[in-house]
């Protein structure tokens, strides 16, 4: 079964995923998707890396660890209840059926009615989007169909799996700035380099 992680509405959620590159800079493509890991790829892809860089991401989804060292943990910014569900981290190791895949269950709790005042970090300031407009997007649009989401009523609570989302804030401090180019001129929520 999936390992369970938690965050509160309005916080950032942290979903850990790691691998060990064969050599420094010798990266393996990784994808993150909403929904359990299918046989290939990652359900509805929200972020992916190639052998060099993060080449596709969507709004609110970030890699804040050092992905060049194999830390491909996902941060989801400012979560809502709709972010609950299963997420797939897939390490796409070349070869015959070599992929490693991990299903992580994210449980979002309603925000406390009277939260203690906390300092909100400026996520955009910490990780500015370095955007250019290199206009070659996908040659055709794929309709994203309905993919597996977990029903909130089915989610069990595992107290020992609690992940304080403030930990994710601390981890961000050592993260690398992610640069990308926007290929969707009319959609600020999707950013990617083409993968060729």
């Amino acid at each position: 079964s999936e390992v369970e992680y938690r965050a509160e509405v309005g916080q950032n959620a942290y979903l850990p995923c790691f691998y060990t590159p064969a050599a420094p800079g010798n990266l393996v493509p990784v994808c993150w998707g909403k929904g359990a890991c299918p046989v290939f790829e990652c359900g509805n892809v929200v972020l992916r890396t190639d052998e060099r860089d993060v080449n596709y991401w969507t709004s609110r989804y970030w890699l804040n660890g050092d992905f060049r060292k194999g830390d491909v943990s996902l941060t989801i910014e400012n979560v809502t209840l709709a972010d609950s569900g299963i997420y797939c981290c897939r390490i796409q190791i070349p070869g015959i059926m070599n992929d490693e895949k991990f299903n992580l269950k994210l449980v979002i709790k309603p925000a406390k009615v009277t939260p203690a005042p906390t300092r909100q970090r400026d996520f955009t300031a910490a990780f500015p989007r370095m955007l250019t407009t290199r206009g070659h997007g996908p040659a055709e649009t794929q309709t994203l169909g309905s993919l597996p989401d977990i029903n909130l009523t089915q989610i069990s609570t595992l107290a020992n799996e609690l992940r304080d989302s403030r930990l994710a804030n601390d981890l961000r401090d050592s993260g690398a700035t992610i640069r990308g180019s926007s290929d969707y001129k009319d959609d600020d929520d999707k950013h990617h380099h083409h993968h060729h």
Partner: antibody, heavy 122, light 107 residues
Framework: EVQLVESGGGLVQPGGSLRLSCAAS????????MAWVRQAPGKGLEWVAN????????YYLDSLKSRFTISRDNAKNSLYLQMNSLRAEDTAVYYC???????????????WGQGTLVTVSS | DIQMTQSPSSLSASVGDRVTITCRAS??????LAWYQQKPGKAPKLLVY???TLAEGVPSRFSGSGSGTDFTLTISSLQPEDFATYYC?????????FGQGTKLEIK
């Protein structure tokens, strides 16, 4: 219009080899996983193999991976299946199919070729 | 391997009938299920993917439902061109596997 056209089928003796080809057009070939699926005469569908966008990752039916090799040439928009040590039970129509794309989402073989018949017999 | 079991194996129905074909997976496949229609001598045609999303160009009389292990394909009002063999297929575990097929015949 998306088109997949298989070729290379035919009659081959047991123990022989064949190389099937699939020519793709009408879409960005390198944006999609591709697959081979086969169907023995009067039988159901059986998945054979898949390959990722650039050919670096391949996936096989366990019983076939020592004899069959899937590959692709994105510059030629072509998919291949090298079949060695063929057996009578490999007799089937072999279909080339387009699988999931670069952004995920659509899990199903959306487009199929017309198929090419491979007959293994002495 | 994940086994896909379709029922019934064959079915006789009349034009205008409502028909339901079921597919059961031996393990949880979430919603990674596709349905295909195949006519004799032709390649299969994708009808539904991700359990309930209708493929492009497929008439709205076809619908898919289910998740986890139990899935259904429903044809709300059979048309003459719908008589064919139908297959389900899972895209969750390796190897990819198909159901054995359901042959839909004219009564």
């Amino acid at each position: 219009e998306v088109q997949l056209v298989e070729s290379g089928g035919g009659l081959v003796q047991p123990g022989g080899s064949l190389r099937l080809s699939c020519a793709a057009s009408g879409f960005t070939f390198s944006d999609y996983y591709m697959a081979w699926v086969r169907q023995a005469p009067g039988k159901g569908l059986e998945w054979v193999a898949n390959i990722n966008y650039d050919g670096s990752s391949t996936y096989y039916l366990d019983s076939l991976k020592s004899r069959f090799t899937i590959s692709r040439d994105n510059a030629k928009n072509s998919l291949y299946l090298q079949m060695n040590s063929l057996r009578a039970e490999d007799t089937a129509v072999y279909y080339c199919a387009r699988d999931v794309g670069y952004y995920g989402g659509n899990y199903g073989f959306a487009y199929w070729g017309q198929g090419t018949l491979v007959t293994v017999s002495s | 391997d994940i086994q896909m079991t379709q029922s019934p194996s064959s079915l006789s129905a009349s034009v205008g009938d409502r028909v339901t074909i079921t597919c059961r997976a031996s393990d949880n496949i979430y919603s990674y299920l596709a349905w295909y229609q195949q006519k004799p001598g032709k390649a299969p045609k994708l009808l539904v993917y991700n359990a309930k999303t209708l493929a492009e160009g497929v008439p709205s009389r076809f619908s898919g439902s289910g998740s986890g292990t139990d899935f259904t394909l429903t044809i709300s009002s059979l048309q003459p061109e719908d008589f064919a063999t139908y297959y389900c297929q899972q895209h969750y575990g390796s190897p990819l596997t198909f159901g054995q097929g359901t042959k839909l015949e004219i009564k």
